[in-house]
């Protein structure tokens, strides 16, 4: 059946899915927070320049009873029942607003008519990518999986004289929705990655990536692994590793790298961390005061994804233009708007770009410090320390493969 | 209506630091992000930095170094702190209600002399 | 940093006159914002996203372009429209301003 869109005659609803089973393990409360002071803001917006309409959102809760694990591995099912719920209320906003789980996003996209925007706090695996009237405003695993190769090809600067083909990638199955995707998407053997390196290996017992760290016939220097330092403390320990050895600690969204009195432990003296670029400092609004580094991001990215839909919203009014039209669904791309905490750009899929930050722990001064940075959106990475103090012989990252590292 | 406001030293003596007070009325601080914005005497507009909706600031590249910008929301005021000024500093220095469809509200300026 | 760049620095035209300036970008920007500002008076945003006449401008101002090539027109020019005018990126750093271009009445 037919299901209207309360989306127009001056009045304009937000359709947001408050799914049990997300990204990020976040009480619905703070995101429902988070939405209605975009809402606030984007009503400000819009009546700073003159357009007098409403904006509401209508939040659609799934049935916690059926659908209680929590994490991502049952929102498939939780999708296609809350698009179940809209269709038999017969009722839907000018936008759709979550899933975060890949599985349940791939879904929903499948089974819906594309004629609304979904934007998505999450939806981070490549399936996800490509999407017309898709929005993701986490950085999803193509962006990772890009820097990742462009970093592995540099070889003309002066902390890396090598270009780089080989990757171990340790991957156990507990990691968390985002890094499960990141890693997914290293794993996988069609991916840009894999078609990329010329030789690349999944470890996916704890015991395999030990054994890698001192293997004089291991076939590459170089781990890649996702989460924070006390995931790699847990599987590390104080173990002794090989001089040549790299390990990538993919972990995007936690900037307590760049608090002022943290210090970095011995045990990451070998790690280079990728992280996002912090994020400008909040003040205390009522969506972010308790929340972790990780979920300020997660709701971050709802709150954004309100302002995203007010920026559309009063473009498409201003210049008179219907909102429920395939145009409007497929608008929310290739375009920059003012984020809550700044400019968020969006590439031609509708793909949040940022700045990654590649750290290094200074044997100095026991701090985080910048290597380099990339732009997601230009695809291209900027050098900071040119002379970095490392661990690495003569401050330069070995070569990828045992035995043929800096002299 | 909307107003902007600024209220500055006057006078600065040089590698002093300048503290400039923007208060604005007609609008709230928690639903429009604010531009600091200079001009020299006789040339043009250089933007100086913005502080967001959510209190994060972004500023010229060439002055970062050299500026803060923070609010208070409840008191509807913006500040912007310049440090170690020289005589090229020298300028009206603007507040301008900012978004990404241009500054449409600006202040009327404050002028700084640097000065000893 | 993206640079804005208008030409030309100074211009004079005549009542009546067409009148076009022009605002060239160092890289590609999504849009650009207008300012107009006579002597001793605060800039007053005049034209914005590209095209978009601010509320009092007179119609005979428009704005077009995209990329790295923007530019103003005035279909006939009168004397109030003497001014220095100003254009305005948001797509790097996040803004940064042209040095101007002084519109003088003959």
């Known amino acids: 059946s037919q299901v209207s869109q309360n989306c127009h005659n001056g009045s304009y609803e937000i359709s947001v899915l408050m799914m049990g089973n997300s990204a990020f393990a976040e009480p619905l409360k703070n995101l429902e927070d988070a939405v209605n002071e975009g809402l606030e803001i984007v009503r400000g917006r819009l009546q700073n320049a003159g357009l007098n309409v409403t904006v509401n959102a209508t939040f659609m809760y799934s049935d916690g009873l059926i659908h209680n694990s929590g994490d991502c591995r049952s929102s498939t099912c939780e999708g296609l029942d809350l698009l179940r719920k809209i269709s038999n209320a017969q009722r839907m906003g000018c936008v759709l607003i979550g899933p975060s789980c890949t599985y349940s996003t791939f879904q929903m996209y499948l089974d819906t008519e594309l004629s609304y925007p979904m934007i998505s706090a999450g939806s981070f695996g490549l399936s996800c990518d490509y999407k017309e009237t898709l929005t993701r405003l986490m950085s999803p695993a193509r962006k990772l999986m890009y820097f990742l190769v462009n970093f592995w090809k540099t070889n003309d600067l002066p902390f890396k004289t090598y270009s780089w083909s080989t990757s171990y990638v340790y991957k156990n199955g507990t990691e968390t929705e985002d890094c499960f995707w990141y890693l997914n998407a290293l794993e996988a053997s069609v991916s840009y990655f894999s078609h990329e390196l010329g030789f690349k290996v999944v470890l996916r017992q704890d015991k395999e990536f030990q054994d890698i760290l001192m293997d004089h016939n291991r076939k590459s220097n170089v781990i890649i692994m996702c989460g924070g330092p006390e995931f790699l403390y847990k599987l590390k320990g104080d173990r002794a590793v090989a001089e040549d050895i790299v390990i990538i600690l993919v972990d995007l969204f936690n900037d307590q790298y760049f608090e002022d009195n943290v210090t970095a432990p011995d045990y990451m003296k070998n790690v280079l961390v990728l992280t996002l670029s912090p994020g400008n400092s909040l003040l205390n609004s009522s969506f972010s005061r308790n929340l972790s580094p990780t979920k300020r991001d997660f709701a971050l990215a709802y709150l954004n994804g309100i302002l995203l839909f007010g920026h559309m919203l009063k473009i498409f009014l201003e210049n008179g233009e219907n909102i429920t039209t395939p145009k409007f669904a497929h608008a929310f791309r290739n375009l920059t708007f003012e984020g809550y905490d700044g400019p968020v750009t969006l590439d031609d899929w509708g793909d949040v770009d940022s700045t990654m930050v590649l750290l290094y722990t200074s044997v100095d001064t026991k701090k985080y410090k910048v290597l380099l940075t990339y732009d997601t959106h230009v695809n291209k990475t900027y050098p900071v320390d040119m002379s970095p103090t490392f661990t690495w012989k003569n401050s330069k990252l070995p070569n990828d493969i045992t035995g043929r590292g800096p002299q | 209506q909307v107003q902007l406001k600024e209220s500055g030293p006057g006078l600065v003596a040089p590698s002093q630091s300048l503290s400039i007070t923007c208060t604005v009325s007609?609008?709230?601080?928690?639903?429009?992000?604010i531009s600091w914005v200079r001009q020299p005497p006789g040339k043009g507009l250089e933007w100086l930095g913005v502080?967001?909706?959510?209190?994060?600031?972004n500023y010229n590249s060439a002055l970062k170094s050299r500026l803060s910008i923070r609010k208070e929301n409840s008191k509807s005021q913006v500040f912007l702190k310049m440090n170690s000024l020289q005589t090229e500093d020298t300028a009206r220095y603007f507040c301008?209600?900012?978004?990404?469809?241009?500054?449409?509200?600006w202040g009327q300026g404050t002028l700084v002399t640097v000065s000893a | 940093q993206i640079v804005l760049t208008q030409s030309p620095a100074i211009m004079s035209a005549s009542p009546g006159e067409k009148v076009t300036m022009t605002c060239s970008a160092s890289?590609?920007?999504?849009?650009m914002h207008w300012y107009q500002q006579k002597s001793g008076t605060s800039p007053k945003r005049w034209i914005y996203?590209?095209?978009k006449l601010a509320s009092g401008v007179p119609a005979r101002f428009s704005g077009s372009g995209s990329g790295t090539s923007y530019s103003l027109t005035i279909t006939s020019m009168e004397a109030e429209d003497a001014a220095t005018y100003y254009c305005q990126q948001w797509s790097g750093n996040p803004y940064t301003f042209g040095g101007g271009t002084k519109l003088e009445i003959k």
């Open positions: 996203d590209t095209s």
């Open positions: 890289s590609s920007v999504n849009y």
């Open positions: 007609g609008f709230s601080l928690s639903r429009n992000a």
């Open positions: 502080i967001w909706t959510g209190g994060g600031t």
């Open positions: 301008a209600r900012s978004g990404y469809d241009g500054f449409d509200y």
